[in-house]
């Protein structure tokens, strides 16, 4: 209710002789600040005096004086909310009730706190989860209802007296709600920890033992088993007996059922700790183990590999790969079930023993057609020799062999003839399915392996065929030896090497690229006129008049061929120069007079030069010289010079007469 002072603190605090006690405490006074505080030990109210009697452990008054003997007890609070206390060291006779007598200006209050001080350090308390299972992580908690700032302690975990290597997390609480020290240890117990003793040890700051608590671990786990076999190596022959025994080395809780497994599958009606196998067969070879269950689950023993030995079974042959391509590598594998594994093999090709082949595998690095056939083998171990199996068939595939191209026509062949060829071969695996021909052309194949060339070309020199199955085999090319008229006839200038100038010695050659047969005749013509019958046409001194269009002809027994017309160009310096005048050689002053330099030249004139009657050069570079306005003093003889890459030529003088205009005459 509102007439009470409000306090918060732990109800009871625990400590031991020589340690200390720290009392966290808060309060709220009814009115104003605290004016007086007395800490009593086992206070009792005296009705006569209306005061409390008892041992005064601490006293603080308005003047703030504190008796010197009170150093052991300290009030760490304040005048309005904190009432924390410290007793250091604490003694056995401090046990009992502490009374906090508080007085404000108008109000009083007595707050009681229990203090339990033991003679020796009291033990911590270990807390375990309700059930511990192997390999499942659990948290072990060690709790001590003590903590004090002036007295440091530590909690250490031990397993069978040996410090545990897992890291523990220690926490402390010094609050108005609780005072404790706690250590938590995360731990994954194994079945071997079952029954082991775990200790939480309380130590002082120097690691000196103060007290401890111990628990015995109850680790639930599946049965742990050992398997024993007779004979110990578990290797027997068909017809022998085998005994296997299962022993439980540990189980928590107790086991309930027993069973046996072979290659992971349960054996029916085998529910005892002993498995007896009489007159074993090879099928009983395998991995055996026993399985024992409890409430946690099943436990399995290690596996025992039982080997029942027997002579090789009839063998089979595996071929990598068939069909095989000629030239490739092939591997044969002899497969035969046997225990122990076969130590020797005998190989057969088409029923005949293959000498020197005693391994499980036979490798042929380069297969040839004669390697085809049936391959079989026999396996042998210490218990005997197996039987030869049915064998496997090797198919060797190869391109067509000995391919030839054959001409069916009578020889010789002429350009334009129809030619028939056939493609022949000796053997093939698989069968030939198509044919190819080189070079490719728009030719017809009237039947498989036959080629017909209509209108054979002059340049159809050779033909080759290929017979194809999965691969193509090409025959050597066969020469058609086609006969034809001369080809690519052309006129070629032999000399001079550069352009032809007037007066040069000139030789023209009639060239052709090929002719079959090779014997030929030549003919030269210009403008339809026959000039000669040699391969060359010669001019000792060429003149511009020899320029023109020339052709040559070449013929053989098949036909004749003409060249393209070839233009003979003769270069010469400007000639036949003359100066023409427009509008005429007599012009009236003030008008325009145009002088033109006319010439015959090859190449054309590239540069003109003009001169007057005193051979003075005039500053004009064109074919035409325009005088506008023309003056009387311009009257006189003019001449021009033309220049091309061959040389120069000059005109004769041409006279220009400029006469006075009527206006000028009138002024005189």
């Amino acid at each position: 209710d509102s007439s009470k002072w409000v306090f918060e603190h732990p109800e009871t605090l625990y400590a031991w002789e020589g340690a200390c006690v720290w009392i966290p405490c808060t309060y709220r006074a009814l009115d104003g600040d605290l004016e007086s505080f007395i800490l009593f030990h086992n206070p009792e109210y005296n009705k006569n005096t209306s005061k409390f009697d008892g041992t005064r452990l601490y006293e603080s008054t308005k003047d703030g004086k504190v008796p010197s003997e009170q150093k052991r007890v300290q009030f760490l609070g304040d005048k309005n909310k904190n009432c924390t206390l410290s007793i250091h060291p604490v003694h056995l006779n401090d046990s009992g009730q502490l009374g906090l007598r508080m007085e404000s200006k108008t109000e009083k209050w007595m707050e009681r706190i229990h203090l339990n001080v033991s003679e020796r350090p009291f033990p911590p308390h270990i807390q375990l989860p309700p059930e511990i299972q192997e390999s499942q992580e659990v948290t072990l908690t060690c709790l001590l209802n003590f903590s004090c700032y002036g007295y440091p302690i530590q909690l250490q975990w031990l397993l069978e007296g040996v410090p545990m290597r897992q890291a523990a997390v220690t926490s402390t609480s010094l609050t108005i709600k609780s005072v404790f020290t706690r250590s938590e240890l995360k731990f994954s117990p194994q079945w071997s920890h079952h029954g082991k003793i775990v200790t939480c040890q309380l130590q002082d700051a120097d690691g000196k033992f103060l007290s401890n608590d111990t628990v015995q671990l109850n680790v639930k786990h599946t049965p742990k088993l050992e398997i024993k076999v007779t004979p110990s190596d578990a290797i027997v022959r068909e017809g022998d007996s085998v005994t296997m025994t299962c022993e439980v080395s540990s189980s928590n809780p107790e086991y309930t059922t027993v069973s046996w497994l072979k290659d992971g599958t349960s054996l029916k009606k085998q529910n005892t700790f002993t498995l007896n196998l009489r007159e074993v067969t090879k099928d009983q070879s395998g991995k055996y183990c026993c399985q024992v269950s409890n409430d946690v689950g099943p436990g399995r023993s290690e596996e025992v590999f039982l080997q029942v030995q027997y002579a090789p079974e009839p063998s089979t042959v595996q071929i990598l790969h068939s069909p095989a391509v000629e030239g490739s590598q092939v591997e044969f594998l002899c497969m035969s079930l046997a225990n122990p594994l076969p130590t020797n093999y005998t190989w057969y090709h088409n029923g005949k023993e293959m000498q020197g082949r005693t391994e499980e595998k036979v490798h042929i690095p380069k297969i040839l057609p004669w390697h085809a056939g049936t391959y079989s083998c026999v396996a042998e171990n210490i218990l005997g020799t197996g039987q030869r199996g049915p064998g496997a068939e090797l198919d060797v595939q190869y391109p067509p062999k000995k391919v030839t191209t054959v001409i069916q026509n009578p020889m010789p062949i002429r350009e334009g003839d129809t030619v028939t060829l056939s493609c022949n071969y000796n053997s093939s695996n698989p069968s030939v399915t198509r044919y190819e021909w080189k070079p490719h052309g728009a030719w017809e194949e009237p039947s498989l392996g036959v080629l017909k060339i209509q209108n054979v070309g002059w340049d159809n020199t050779t033909i080759a065929c290929a017979a194809c199955n999965s691969w193509c085999s090409w025959a050597s090319p066969v020469a058609l030896n086609v006969q034809y008229a001369p080809r690519d006839v052309r006129v070629r200038k032999i000399k001079p090497l550069s352009e032809i100038h007037s007066g040069n010695s000139v030789s023209l050659q009639c060239d052709f690229s090929s002719s079959h047969p090779k014997e030929v005749q030549f003919f030269w013509e210009k403008n339809g006129r026959l000039l000669g019958k040699e391969s060359q046409l010669n001019f000792d001194s060429i003149s511009p008049e020899d320029a023109g269009s020339y052709s040559c002809w070449v013929n053989n027994s098949i036909g004749q061929t003409a060249s393209k017309a070839w233009t003979l160009e003769v270069l010469y310096a400007p000639r036949r120069l003359r100066v023409s005048m427009s509008p005429g050689d007599q012009v009236m002053e003030g008008k325009s007079a145009t002088l033109t330099c006319e010439s015959d030249a090859n190449p054309p004139v590239s540069h003109y030069t003009w001169f007057d009657w005193n051979n003075q050069s005039l500053p004009y570079h064109s074919q035409k010289l325009r005088l506008e306005p023309v003056k009387v003093q311009h009257s006189g003889a003019y001449w021009c010079q033309g220049t091309n890459s061959v040389g120069k030529g000059r005109s004769p003088l041409s006279t220009l007469t400029v006469y006075y205009s009527p206006e000028t005459i009138g002024r005189r």
């Epitope: 009657w613 005193n614 500053p619 035409k624």
Partner: antibody, heavy 127, light 112 residues
């Protein structure tokens, strides 16, 4: 060193005659390897050749078709100078007028370029 | 007679090369080897830099060179310098009655 010195008015009224003189020093007008030219420059027409005069056995002159009929080039051999007369001028004739020499012989070969120029005269045609 | 065609402007950094083209017809540039090039600084008269396609007058730097192919002539300035910044004009003799024709001019800027 050949030098060309120009003289003449900078302002001419429309329809009047533009008259400029070019005095030559360091060369003779009678040289038979030179021609004496007039060129003008304006923002609208750029550089434009107007005409030339030269002496060989007699005096000759040539004119650009754009001004032929209203242009004449006169020579004064005694003063070694030549002049440009451009009649009936319009504002279109405004620009900088230059006299320039062409030397037609470079050693033994022909040549043709304006190798010496006058300083230029800015002529404005305006009323 | 139409003027010869030149690019309106060209530019280059100091030390670089720049080429200016001049395109005409077979009646002028293509017909004669009388192409010349002129440099003009503002307010000054043109100065002859190249004559007869590729010849250099004495006193002109050998950084200036000229060439011609068909109807197009070219001026190349190598190792550009700040003082090369100017207007450049080409000119050619022509077969028309207007005996000389000039180019439209190219303003060369030297970037700094």
């Amino acid at each position: 060193e050949v030098q060309l010195q120009q003289s003449g008015p900078g302002l001419v009224k429309p329809s009047q005659t533009l008259s400029l003189t070019c005095a030559i020093s360091g060369d003779s007008m009678l040289s038979n390897s030179d021609t004496w030219n007039w060129i003008r420059q304006s923002p609208s027409r750029g550089l434009e050749w107007l005409g030339r005069t030269y002496h060989r056995s007699t005096w000759y002159d040539d004119y650009a078709s754009s001004v032929r009929g209203r242009v004449s080039i006169n020579v004064d051999t005694s003063k070694n100078q030549y002049s440009l007369q451009l009649n009936a001028v319009t504002p279109e004739d405004t620009g900088v007028y230059y006299c320039a020499r062409v030397r037609l012989q470079d050693g033994n070969s022909w040549s043709d370029a304006f190798d010496v120029w006058g300083q230029g005269t800015m002529v404005t045609v305006s009323s | 007679q139409s003027a010869l065609t030149q690019p309106a402007s060209a530019s280059g950094s100091p030390g670089q090369s720049v080429t200016i083209s001049c395109t005409g017809t077979s009646s002028d540039v293509g017909g004669y080897n009388y192409v010349s090039w002129y440099q003009q600084h503002p307010g000054k008269a043109p100065k002859l830099m190249i004559y007869d396609v590729s010849n250099r007058p004495s006193g002109v730097s050998n950084r200036f060179s000229g060439s011609k192919s068909g109807n197009t002539a070219s001026l190349t300035i190598s190792g550009l310098q700040a003082e090369d910044e100017a207007d450049y004009y080409c000119s050619s003799y022509t077969s028309s009655s207007t005996l000389y024709v000039f180019g439209t001019g190219t303003q060369l800027t030297v970037l700094t």
